[in-house]
């Protein structure tokens, strides 16, 4: 019997200061190039090493970005979202959704050698 995969969804406000080379991440998604089926949201596809996002440490690959400086990212074309980030200014506030995978084992199952059994 396989364990069930559940997801814990949390939201967080992340304030980034634009570094010398920018914010330091890549995105996918948008109404014209859905990354998740039936979801035109904007997702973080890559965090660049030593970039502003990586140095801050909170933004993760796979996070969904809900808004930038209070502006909703719903129903945006991909490049419109890119332009929004590029023009977001020096201090950038991101509302993000983290999706943490939680592995639930079958009820009553204990691993071999589990001392609590």
């Amino acid at each position: 019997m396989n364990g069930r995969v559940d997801y814990l969804v949390t939201e967080e406000e992340i304030n980034l200061t634009r570094g010398p080379s920018g914010l330091g991440f890549n995105i996918v998604g948008g109404t014209d190039q859905q990354y998740v089926s039936n979801d035109s949201g904007i997702y973080v596809s890559r965090i660049k090493e030593n970039g502003a996002a990586a140095l801050d440490g909170r933004l993760q690959e796979g996070d969904k970005i809900l808004s930038v400086n209070g502006q909703d990212l719903k129903n945006l074309l991909h490049q419109d979202a890119v332009d929004l980030f590029r023009n977001a200014g020096y201090a950038v506030s991101l509302r993000v959704q983290h999706r943490l995978q939680v592995q639930n084992g079958p009820i009553g199952h204990r691993g071999e050698g589990d001392p609590s059994g």
Partner: nanobody, 127 residues
Framework: HVQLVESGGGLVQAGASLRLSCAAS????????MAWFRQAPGKEREFVAE????????WYSDSVKGRFTISRDNAKNTVYLQMNNLKPEDTAVYYC?????????????????????WGQGTQVTVS
């Protein structure tokens, strides 16, 4: 292996126009983005213009906005830079670059570190 060859540079007077071409060979042309950068004597290489395939958007540096136009011809595997009303400060070696990172679009203004392939450059001198 992608090869980029620029042409069209030269010596012109202020106010004149030039059109640079960059021919790509050795790979598919529909990369994420093509761009032009330039390097003036004694200065860092700087971004000029980018043409992204996503919704065919273009992006220009403030110094060339309204004077330069980037375009591409996929059938000819070529990207162009039309430069009008040239100024002495436009004097530089102009480089064509190709960005092929498919892990999404960078949210940052075009930066030379993003680009994977570069041409040898073509000299533009404005007197």
């Amino acid at each position: 292996h992608v090869q980029l060859v620029e042409s069209g540079g030269g010596l012109v007077q202020a106010g004149a126009s030039l059109r640079l071409s960059c021919a790509a060979s050795g790979g598919t042309f529909s990369s994420y983005a093509m761009a032009w950068f330039r390097q003036a004597p004694g200065k860092e290489r700087e971004f000029v213009a980018e043409d992204s395939w996503s919704n065919h958007r273009v992006w220009y540096s403030d110094s060339v906005k309204g004077r330069f136009t980037i375009s591409r011809d996929n059938a000819k595997n070529t990207v162009y830079l039309q430069m009008n009303n040239l100024k002495p400060e436009d004097t530089a070696v102009y480089y064509c670059a190709d960005y092929r990172d498919y892990s999404g679009s960078t949210v940052d203004p075009p930066n030379q570190s993003e680009y994977d392939y570069w041409g040898q450059g073509t000299q533009v001198t404005v007197s």
